[in-house]
């Protein structure tokens, strides 16, 4: 999808001029002299994160479509596999390799000229927005997390289910209906619709030429393409639509103006695009079809939207239509159509994100309203953790409760968890574990969100199928967390991936605040006061040597805990005491890069391990590098 | 000579559903393809609430869409009109109509929203 | 607020011919087929013209349309005192995706 990590693999390239057609391309060819070799590289208009390479031979332009496979590489169909559009350039520079000569002189974009963004591409942002806020309910911050973490995955979302937010997708209705409906209204040569024929992706475009309506089949092939018969293959409709808009390219003649679901006003935006010959007043608009959509409606998940009316022409060509799909094409009715996002679990959001649901002025919890299961989840530092569940003003919540051990009545150790409750009931973020609050009776209770699957560390040593492209998402799921504890002010101090539990296979939340520490806004670390138990494997020198933790330090901990997550929750410096870890860091030895670990990850870490803090990178710079990273290896 | 027949009470309490049925007689419903609600306020103009098509498929005018079902009976030969959450500003004459082009009225029926 | 604008009354004597006009724009009259619709008193509409200038079977060939640009009429002539009625024209508008209603006419016969 020509999304931010398919521009950056190409957009620094000066022969890419990305989303311009063929004829655009042979155009350029032109203007570079058509000599031998000349070529130039553009975006593909018809396959997602593809591109195309238009080559001149022999006084005419050949083109080849590099598609993008599964694992990201490239390729052009038949061909061998290149990590990146300009090796495959660099490749056929040297090997024409089924090209009709070699590539010998790039055509540069001239001056001043930027690559085009593609229809959708202007679009994409915007629906990505509204998507999210409209499916989860989200707003603010919780809304730009969720499109930070998930970007990847709501582009695919939005690319390929696009289609059902645009005016001229009408859903399954029947051959009949579609006819009058393109013939209610005006009666533009090129009025279009496309509807679903059945439940196997296959569609149909229905086409007004001369009063009559014309329905062509779109079949999906085995790899999920669609075409009209003996056409050309698109992986979306919207390209395809696109593509038709442009040039008939076997239709009896382009698509103009999209017809209408009845009842879906203001959706269509048309003007700009000089006036057609026989075409209709306000037909064209710059950029073809999808670019003159200009609102959107997403129905809340879970939510049928009862669908609108049509129009019949029988004695009657009038000017009357409402119409929507019987289901709500992105209802994320959370089941098996796609896998959990973080935003369709219940953690989320903050549980008094409802308005209706009071946030206490007291961190102390109500015990009769918590309900604890016998079997424990797990022990820690402070005693066992129980899930439990207890009743807020309108709904009961699963949550993972804490509870003291019962000689651990010790002042001081009730003084570190109510230090640990203050500071986690300020935090409020969807990557950091929240709490609800404490309960004191027969012993101190932390009350905490549920991460069902547990700590990292545990859930990869037992889950060894996990792609490194998900460890990718959940490190910087954990980037993004630490990101909002830096912005916070807040030293966590035990950073590790014991410390990181699991909602989903695709959701983390960093979690045990129990040594952090609430810093003061003008001070950018604090002095520990006594040497405790120590996690020296994770902690950096400074903190070793000058007891100084600061966020700098948590990013140190951070790239262990990256280390930890690559080796599938092996233990850092294995075999290794403290004083060995310490003195083998004073050498400027590192720990070796995990079996498999791509090597952009394994720089990274090693740049969490700059010794000097001062040179040490903090979680803004970290968590938009893995950020990079991710949108690329996911894309 | 097709006839269209409006029926429901004539009186509804605020925030209830109104509910109103059109009979068709004369005329099979799957004959023709569209079947609408129209309305008019006491005094005022027409407003367009809906169509169904005879296959089930809904239309409704947008600024009534989350309030309104229209759905088909072709056993019985008749549509209905649910709106729900009703005030006052609902009060108005219903008239069900045949075709896109509403060529065939009922003769109305008023719906106070009163309570 | 209508989105095809009518005035709100006309006025003439039997046997003269008088003219309800009903303007919109390019996405609806402009572009599509005007109807026009007569409301006796305390009776339900009915179809007056259809495509602009068509009658229903019944429809006396008194009542006319026509339409030009983004403006449509409906001229009656050789008024009668059972004319006095209620007219609305009707267009479906393209960009709306459904069918417009112009205010309504009142017309009275003198």
């Known amino acids: 999808m020509a999304s931010s990590g398919m521009a950056d693999s190409a957009n620094h390239l000066p022969f890419f001029f990305g989303n311009i057609t063929r004829e655009e391309a042979e155009d350029y060819l032109v203007q570079g002299g058509m000599s031998d070799g000349l070529y130039l590289l553009r975006q593909s208009r018809n396959y997602l994160g593809g591109f195309a390479l238009s080559v001149a031979h022999g006084r005419k332009a050949h083109h080849y479509t590099i598609e993008r496979e599964l694992n990201g590489t490239y390729a052009i169909a038949g061909g061998r596999t290149h990590a990146s559009p300009a090796d495959l350039c660099h490749y056929h520079s040297q090997e024409s390799d089924g090209l009709v000569c070699l590539l010998k002189k790039p055509f540069n974009r001239p001056q001043g000229v930027q690559p085009k963004t593609g229809p959708f591409e202007d679009l994409k942002e915007n629906l990505i927005r509204e998507y999210v806020k409209q499916t989860w309910n989200l707003q603010g911050q919780a809304l730009e997390q969720a499109i930070i973490s998930q970007k990847p995955q709501l582009e695919k979302l939005i690319a390929t289910t696009a289609h059902e937010k645009m005016p001229w997708f009408h859903g399954k209705i029947s051959r009949e209906e579609s006819e009058q409906i393109v013939l209610i209204g005006s009666k533009t040569n090129g009025k279009f619709l496309i509807r679903a024929r059945d439940n196997n992706g296959s569609y149909a475009l229905c086409l007004l030429h001369e009063g009559k309506v014309l329905h062509y089949r779109i079949d999906k092939d085995k790899t999920g393409k669609l075409s009209i018969p003996e056409g050309k293959k698109f992986d979306t409709l919207w390209q395809l639509v696109e593509h038709y808009s442009y040039k008939a390219d076997g239709l009896l003649r382009v698509l103009t103006v999209p017809c209408q679901k009845i009842g879906t006003q203001g959706n269509v935006n048309f003007g700009g695009r000089p006036q057609l010959p026989g075409s209709h007043p306000a037909t064209w608009s710059a950029g073809g079809i999808i670019s003159r959509i200009k609102s959107y409606s997403f129905p809340k998940p879970g939510h049928r939207k009862s669908s609108p009316a049509q129009g019949n022409r029988q004695e009657s060509t009038v000017s009357f239509n409402p119409y929507e799909p019987e289901l709500a094409p992105w209802a994320a009715d959370k089941g098996p159509q796609r896998e959990a996002l973080p935003m369709d679990t219940e953690v989320y959001e903050s549980p008094y994100a409802d308005p209706e649901e009071i946030r206490p002025k007291e961190v102390y919890l109500d015990r009769k309203l918590l309900t604890l299961e016998d079997k424990e989840l797990g022990s820690g530092n402070f005693g066992t953790v129980k899930k439990g569940y207890y009743q807020m003003k309108k709904v009961v919540k699963t949550v993972a409760v804490k509870i003291l051990k019962n000689e651990a009545n010790d002042p001081a150790l009730k003084d570190e968890l109510l230090a640990e409750a203050n500071v986690m009931q300020q935090l409020d973020n969807p990557y950091i574990v929240r709490m609800i609050g404490i309960c004191e009776a027969e012993s101190w209770m932390l009350v905490m969100e549920m991460a069902e699957l547990g700590p990292l560390n545990k859930y990869l040593q037992q889950n060894r199928h996990v792609k490194d492209k998900n460890i990718i998402e959940l490190v910087h799921q954990v980037s993004m967390g630490m990101k909002y504890l830096e912005e916070s002010n807040f030293v966590h101090r035990d950073l590790a991936a014991r410390n990181v539990l699991l909602v989903t296979q695709h959701y983390a939340k960093i979690s045990d605040f129990g040594l952090s520490k609430a810093l003061r806004a003008d001070e950018n670390y604090y002095k520990a006061q006594t040497h405790g138990k120590w996690p020296v494997k994770w902690y950096a020198p400074e903190c070793i040597n000058y007891y100084k933790f600061s966020s700098k330090s948590d990013v140190w901990s951070f790239g262990v805990l990256m280390w930890e997550a690559f080796s599938y929750g092996q233990k850092p410096y294995r075999g290794m005491k403290g004083s060995e870890v310490t003195a083998m860091l004073e050498k400027g030895e590192r720990m070796g890069c995990p079996a498999g670990c791509p090597r952009e990850m394994y720089d990274l870490m090693n740049l969490c391990w700059t010794y000097d803090v001062e040179n040490r990178p903090g979680f803004a710079a970290v968590e938009l590098r893995l950020r990079n990273y991710y949108y690329d290896v996911v894309n | 000579q097709v006839q269209l027949q409006e029926s429901g009470p004539g009186l509804v309490k605020p925030s209830d559903t109104l509910s109103l049925t059109c009979a068709v007689s004369?005329?099979?419903?799957?004959?023709?393809?569209?079947w609408g609600w129209i309305r008019q306020p006491p005094g005022k103009g027409l407003e367009w609430i809906g169509y169904?098509?005879?296959?089930?498929?809904?239309y409704y005018n947008p600024s009534l869409k989350s309030r309104v079902t229209i759905s088909v009976d072709k056993s019985k030969n008749q549509f209905s009109l649910k709106l729900s959450s009703v005030t006052a500003a609902d009060t108005a004459v219903y008239y069900c109509a045949r075709n896109v082009g509403f060529h065939d009225w009922g003769q109305g029926t008023l719906v106070t929203v009163s309570s | 607020q209508s989105v095809l604008t009518q005035p709100p009354s006309a006025s003439g004597t039997p046997g003269q011919r008088v003219t309800i006009s009903c303007s919109g724009s390019?996405?609806?009259?402009?572009?599509?087929?005007v109807y026009w619709y007569q409301q006796l008193p305390g009776t339900a509409p009915k179809l007056l013209i259809y495509r602009n200038n068509q009658r229903p079977s019944g429809v006396p060939d008194r009542f006319s349309g026509s339409k030009s640009g983004t403006s449509a009429s409906l001229a009656i002539s050789g008024l009668r005192s059972e004319d006095e009625a209620d007219y609305y024209c009707?267009?479906?508008?393209?960009?709306?995706?459904?069918?417009?209603f112009g205010g309504g006419t009142k017309l009275t016969v003198l």
């Open positions: 009707a267009a479906w508008d393209d960009s709306l995706a459904s069918p417009v």
């Open positions: 169904i098509y005879h296959s089930g498929s809904t």
């Open positions: 390019s996405s609806n009259i402009g572009s599509n087929y």
């Open positions: 004369g005329y099979s419903i799957s004959s023709s393809n569209w």
